[in-house]
Interface confidence: low
């Protein structure tokens, strides 16, 4: 069958279903493409004008391609194999109720299937495959392609080469020992430390200097890149990840369903649109949220903000601020604050900085 004779493929969303927010449609389609780019050398980019290789369309009934939709239920969507014109295009039946969750028809799951067709895959006889012809809802937080899906797509395009893993060619892996390196978010996860930057994270295991870089999407395919804040409650095996006004909960390294949720559920006022950094202190069972030049303190037991906040960072963390990029808690007494390429070891019992380091000092640079 036909395949795309190139690795950079564009897509365009022609119109939007009224069933979902536009951003949710964009997100579902982007994540669906990412499912396939994670296992192939293909890279997908969204364009808003002009001719795209793959056009995503919501339509009902007869819509000009001799393959009329059939109303609610039945055929949910269809797509055309690679080629010019209508080739590659994916059409979604507007008579379905499109959703981000298990109610109605999940757009992400359906899009993964249809994009499979857009890339040249036929149906699979394996009921576990996303290319199986029957729609089945599965938890999108733990969704992954079956071995059959991966075999199929890699027979057409090969596997992702080490230097081709990036869905976006100009967002290359940051140099770990660059003295100007800064991090978006840092948190412990058990005996490991996760350092987030763009679409990557580095993993530092206990005292070993060796570290490895990974794509966030390779561990958690449904999470976005550019995580801005993170904290761990180790006793609960929970990690909270923040981006913009949303947060995700990871339990035992698995994303929990029904996320992301709004950061405002923590009790932030509406003007807070994103979190810069967060850290949990198990001694006090409190989480500190850093937003611009202020911080809030959240009682994890009572699940509510402590009164008297926000406070100025500079007032209560001597030598830190006015803003920070990331922070984590370690060794029962230290916060490690990250500001640009600098890092400050802060003894919260003495309430002062005890060491100044480079942000990448953890990696033996």
């Amino acid at each position: 069958g036909p395949v795309w004779r190139k690795h950079y493929i564009t897509y365009r969303i022609n119109n939007y279903t009224p069933d979902m927010n536009r951003e949710d449609v964009d997100y579902a389609i982007r994540k669906a493409f990412q499912v396939w780019s994670n296992v192939t050398p293909l890279k997908f980019s969204k364009i808003n004008t002009g001719m795209a290789d793959i056009l995503v369309v919501f339509a009902r009934g007869a819509h000009g391609d001799f393959h009329a939709f059939d109303g609610k239920g039945g055929i949910l969507a269809h797509a055309f194999g690679p080629g010019s014109g209508i080739g590659g295009d994916a059409h979604f039946d507007e008579d379905e109720f499109w959703t981000t969750h298990s109610g109605g028809t999940n757009l992400f799951l359906t899009a993964v299937h249809e994009i499979g067709h857009s890339l040249g895959l036929g149906h699979s006889s394996d009921p576990k495959a996303v290319m199986f012809p029957t729609y089945k809802y599965v938890d999108i937080n733990t969704f992954r392609l079956s071995a059959d899906d991966i075999r199929g797509i890699q027979s057409l395009y090969g596997d992702p080469k080490e230097n081709q893993r990036l869905p976006n060619p100009d967002n290359s892996e940051p140099a770990l020992c660059d003295p100007n390196l800064s991090f978006d978010a840092v948190t412990t996860v058990g005996n490991k430390i996760f350092f987030f930057k763009d679409r990557f994270f580095w993993l530092k295991v206990s005292e070993r200097p060796k570290t490895s870089v990974n794509l966030i999407s390779s561990l958690w395919p449904t999470l976005p890149s550019g995580i801005e804040a993170a904290y761990e409650i180790e006793a609960r095996n929970q990690v909270f990840l923040f981006k913009d006004d949303k947060y995700w909960l990871i339990s035992n390294l698995r994303p929990e369903p029904n996320y992301p949720k709004s950061i405002h559920s923590f009790g932030f006022p509406n003007f807070v649109k994103k979190i810069d950094a967060a850290v949990f202190n198990p001694r006090f069972y409190r989480t500190y949220f850093f937003v611009d030049n202020q911080y809030w303190r959240y009682d994890e037991r009572r699940q509510m903000m402590d009164p008297g906040y926000p406070k100025l960072i500079t007032k209560n963390f001597q030598g830190i601020g006015p803003k920070i990029d990331a922070v984590f808690y370690s060794k029962n007494k230290y916060y490690y604050f990250f500001q640009g390429s600098n890092q400050f070891e802060y003894d919260f019992l003495l309430q002062r900085i005890t060491k100044t380091l480079k942000s990448n000092s953890w990696f033996g640079c």
Partner: antibody, heavy 123, light 107 residues
Framework: EVQLLESGGGLVQPGGSLRLSCAAS????????MAWVRQAPGKGLEWVSS????????HYADSVKGRFTISRDNSKNTLYLQMNSLRAEDTAVYYC????????????????WGQGTLVTVSS | DIQMTQSPSSLSASVRDRVTITCRTS??????LNWYYQAPGRAPKLLIF???SLHRGVSSRFSGSGDGTEFTLTISSLQPEDIGTYFC?????????FGQGTKVEIK
């Protein structure tokens, strides 16, 4: 070997409370969803409640919502069911069950069950 | 809630007979169907999950089939230790629901 051992059942008056416990062993308790399933005398099985591995999310049957609370203590490998405002129709053997997730195309199933504990609600 | 209807509600068969139990669902549940066996006075045990996958240690004389709304549990050669009640259960959508059970006896 997976073992689930329920306790805490007994006779209670309507409107009363009971707390059931389920001690788990033979598997990594903190990694699995757990559930309570009940069976009224001579009747079929009825799912009561499930709890996620972390304890962060819970689900309940409509018949017990607002009256029963499922919880777990992963450090003690123990599952709990707090039952308040008990009614005669809650009389049943309550089973603790381990849930597993076969793969990403098939749902949860109860792969191991305890021996059950009898709860009798009667005046 | 998804309704589960098992048939027959009871059956009597001879040792080594082929026995078939059917489970119908009120809506399409794809392959989210499990089967359990409960010996008299004992706790239920998992037999089959995901329509046709045998649980660890379950005899190969048990098999499952079906898709959508109609499912079948087959015992290829009934043995005395198979007497008891068989339940189907869906995990397509919460609340998980069970069939009313099929009681199997030996003639």
């Amino acid at each position: 070997e997976v073992q689930l051992l329920e306790s805490g059942g007994g006779l209670v008056q309507p409107g009363g409370s009971l707390r059931l416990s389920c001690a788990a062993s033979g598997f990594t308790f903190s990694e699995y969803q757990m559930a309570w399933v009940r069976q009224a005398p001579g009747k079929g099985l009825e799912w009561v409640s499930s709890i996620y591995p972390s304890g962060g999310h819970t689900h309940y049957a409509d018949s017990v919502k607002g009256r029963f609370t499922i919880s777990r203590d992963n450090s003690k490998n123990t599952l709990y069911l707090q039952m308040n405002s008990l009614r005669a129709e809650d009389t049943a053997v309550y089973y603790c069950a381990k849930e597993s997730y076969y793969d990403f195309w098939s749902g949860y199933y109860f792969d191991y069950w305890g021996q059950g504990t009898l709860v009798t609600v009667s005046s | 809630d998804i309704q589960m209807t098992q048939s027959p509600s009871s059956l009597s068969a001879s040792v080594r007979d082929r026995v078939t139990i059917t489970c119908r669902t009120s809506q399409n549940i794809n392959t989210y169907l499990n089967w359990y066996y409960q010996a008299p006075g004992r706790a239920p045990k998992l037999l089959i999950f995901g329509v046709s996958s045998l649980h660890r240690g379950v005899s190969s004389r048990f098999s499952g089939s079906g898709d959508g709304t109609e499912f079948t549990l087959t015992i290829s050669s009934l043995q005395p230790e198979d007497i008891g009640t068989y339940f189907c259960q869906q995990s397509y959508s919460s609340p998980w629901t069970f069939g009313q059970g099929t009681k199997v006896e030996i003639k």
